[in-house]
């Protein structure tokens, strides 16, 4: 009696179980009563990443430099190419089909987490005692200068965007 189900890494065709092609190879012809499944390796710039019965290999992903992409990991016959973004850019999606420029943190905000190829900059407000006077994708909030340790006094208090202004002890008010 013909089988109704096949073992793992097999497929059912014409009432018989044929071996699937291994990753990196595509199907040329199904097995018969007398012959094994015929498979052929994928060509250059092609891949198949599973045991399969595909008659065509998939094209490797193209990392388009015009979209800010570059190759992070070159594809093989069994794996797709992995794209990432150029320095200063990050992917717009998990699939990394295009890139956008890293966000900068405005004055009054510092970088909490520097951007990576897959995540944007995370900014945080500078709390009292800290400031940032630049727009930057790298700078954290800086602590206000301690006038006391320089034997000076505060002439003007700091803000989240400006450092304190120190002056001599004997200043005229």
């Amino acid at each position: 009696e013909p089988p109704t189900a096949c073992r793992e890494k097999q497929y059912l065709i014409n009432s018989q179980c044929c071996s699937l092609c291994q990753p990196g190879q595509k199907l040329v012809s199904d097995c018969t009563e007398f012959t094994e499944t015929e498979c052929l390796p994928c060509g250059e710039s092609e891949f198949l990443d599973t045991w399969n019965r595909e008659t065509h290999c998939h094209q490797h992903k193209y990392c388009d430099p015009n979209l800010g992409l570059r190759v992070q990991q070159k594809g093989t016959s069994e794996t797709d190419t992995i794209c990432t973004c150029e320095e200063g850019w990050h992917c717009t999606s998990e699939a990394c089909e295009s890139c956008v420029l890293h966000r900068s943190c405005s004055p009054g905000f510092g970088v909490k987490q520097i951007a990576t190829g897959v995540s944007d900059t995370i900014c945080e407000p500078c709390p009292v005692g800290f400031f940032s006077n630049v727009s930057s994708a790298f700078e954290k909030c800086h602590p206000w200068t301690s006038c006391e340790t320089k034997d000076l006094v505060v002439q003007q208090a700091g803000t989240n965007k400006t450092d304190v202004v120190c002056g001599p002890q004997d200043r005229l008010r």
Epitope: G110, E124, G129, E148, V154, Q155
Partner: antibody, heavy 122, light 113 residues
């Protein structure tokens, strides 16, 4: 020890001004922020503004800009909070408190004055 | 401005009870550079000035009994009184000091049941 002593209770007419004082002792007055907080009858605490006496630098809550003037006199270690154009809604207890001491890490209010009741009534 | 929301607004409890008051801020009070939460707790008794209990969200002020403890991080904070004493019946306020303007929670009144 740190002490903040405020001026006595005041009764004022609507439209007038009031100036509350806060005399500090037991610490370096010029390098520590003085904060002003008010509490209307049966209500919560509301921050009004602050001053760093040594520099004269001030911060005000948006609501109190143009309504409140905070000053300090280093020679007498006294801070002042002047409230203008008084209305009945300004009836409250006004507190001064010590904020950061120049270390930039003590922004909480560790010492408070006893409070000054300002009553605005015609 | 950072909004501070306390709950409950009042709680009735007996001497010896464990009391928990929560405070939520509209933005994170945790600063990554120093890993500190810019939050304080105060106790106020009728006719008296507020008294500092806790700062940096969990550091007890000198002289404050250890039945008072603060916890939490980011936007959610808790003040716990482990075993309520007669002198603890008062109103409690949280306050942030992350950035101007400083703001307080609306207060939680701890009343005798």
């Amino acid at each position: 020890q740190v002490q903040l002593v405020q001026s006595g209770a005041e009764v004022k007419k609507p439209g007038s001004s009031v100036k509350v004082s806060c005399k500090a002792s037991g610490y370096t007055f010029s390098t520590s922020w003085i904060e002003w907080i008010r509490q209307a009858p049966g209500q919560g605490l509301e921050w009004m503004g602050s001053i760093l006496p040594g520099s004269g630098s001030t911060n005000y809550a948006e609501k109190f800009k143009g309504k409140v003037t905070i000053t300090a006199d280093e020679s007498t270690s006294t801070a002042y909070m002047e409230l203008s154009s008084l209305r009945s809604e300004d009836t409250a207890v006004y507190y001064c408190a010590r904020g950061d001491d120049g270390s930039y890490v003590r922004w909480y209010f560790d010492h408070w004055g006893q409070g000054t009741l300002v009553t605005v009534s015609s | 401005d950072i909004q501070m929301t306390q709950s409950p607004s009042s709680v009735s409890a007996s001497v010896g009870d464990r009391v928990t008051i929560t405070c939520r801020s509209s933005q994170s009070l945790l600063f990554s550079v120093n890993q500190k939460n810019y939050l304080a707790w105060y106790q106020q008794k009728p006719g008296k000035a507020p008294k500092l209990l806790i700062y940096w969200a969990s550091t007890r002020e000198s002289g404050v009994p250890d039945r008072f403890s603060g916890s939490g991080s980011g936007t959610d904070f808790t003040l716990t009184i482990s075993s309520l004493q007669p002198e603890d019946f008062a109103t409690y306020y949280c306050q942030h000091y992350y950035s101007y303007p400083w703001t307080f929670g609306q207060g939680t009144k701890v009343e005798i049941k």
